[in-house]
């Protein structure tokens, strides 16, 4: 018999972590990003 | 608060098509995960599940029974329809629709309270 | 199609009695996601059935305690600690990891 279906509420397919610095000039600092991407 | 009614023809003849609708509220078919089965129940006998359809319009049916039975949906209306062609005296019985709840329960929970259907020459 | 079996068919008893009604599958009833798809419903008379149990052994909202239910594989049973005359009617058995979705004959639970 075949099953019946039955879905799971979701599924992480990938996620990724990035960071990124820019410079700011003649402040000499740096802001540092996190960016966090995923597709539910 | 979830209601599911069923409205049928009452009586129809042997050959006729049956057509069935289940009017439902409390709950939307676009929601995921959702869905609504037919079941029918002969008089003082057993269940017997018919047909299902899913929030995303798939849907699966009895094999014994597959080549007579169609079921559709209007989401926006809030209703599911069962048709069942060539029909015969033992499609006489009480038909049921009844609401599934996917992830993380997957079950049917809530039942309408059922239509007679008689089939008769 | 998987072939429901349930024992006894009529069960009865006296109010505040233990009730265990027996549920037997003809093949597994573990999905290929891990759950199993039992479930227990309860009919009165002209009333549609009533859902008790999910997935073995879990309680569905406003189902009193002393319904429990337990088993694995193919081998399942709904135990009632001490039956209320709320309780009466027929019990049934539902598996929903195959097609077709089927149903155990149902279990009378009456009166002695």
């Known amino acids: 018999d075949a099953e019946f279906r039955h879905d799971s509420g979701y599924e992480v397919h990938h996620q990724k972590l990035v960071f990124f610095a820019e410079d700011v000039g003649s402040n000499k600092g740096a802001i540092i990003g996190l960016m966090v991407g995923g597709v539910v | 608060q979830v209601t599911l009614k069923e409205s049928g023809p009452g009586i129809l003849q042997p050959s006729q098509t049956l057509s069935l609708t289940c009017s439902f509220s409390?709950?939307?078919?676009?929601?995921?995960?959702?869905?609504v089965s037919w079941i029918r129940q002969p008089s003082g006998k057993g269940l017997e599940w018919l047909a299902h359809i899913y929030w995303d319009d798939d849907k699966r049916y009895n094999p014994s029974l597959k080549s007579r039975l169609t079921i559709s949906k209007d989401t926006s209306r809030n209703q599911v329809f069962l048709k069942i062609t060539s029909v015969d005296t033992a499609d006489t019985a009480t038909y049921y629709c009844?609401?599934?709840?996917?992830?993380?329960?997957?079950?049917?929970?809530?039942w309408g309270a059922g239509t007679t259907v008689t089939v008769s020459s | 199609d998987v072939v429901m079996t349930q024992t006894p068919l009529s069960l009865p008893v006296s109010l505040g009695d233990q009730a265990s009604i027996s549920c037997r599958s003809s093949q597994s009833l573990v999905h290929s996601n891990g759950n199993t798809y039992l479930h227990w419903y309860l009919q009165k008379p002209g009333q549609s059935p009533k859902l008790l149990i999910y997935k073995v052994s879990n309680r569905f909202f406003g189902v009193p305690d002393r319904f429990s239910g337990s088993g694995s594989g193919t081998d399942f049973t709904l135990k009632i600690s001490r039956v209320e005359a709320e309780d009466l009617g027929v019990y049934f058995c539902s598996q929903t990891t195959y097609v077709p979705l089927t149903f155990g004959a149902g279990t009378k639970l009456e009166l002695k």
């Open positions: 409390g709950f939307s078919l676009s929601t995921s995960g959702m869905g």
């Open positions: 009844a609401r599934y709840d996917g992830y993380p329960y997957w079950y049917f929970d809530v």
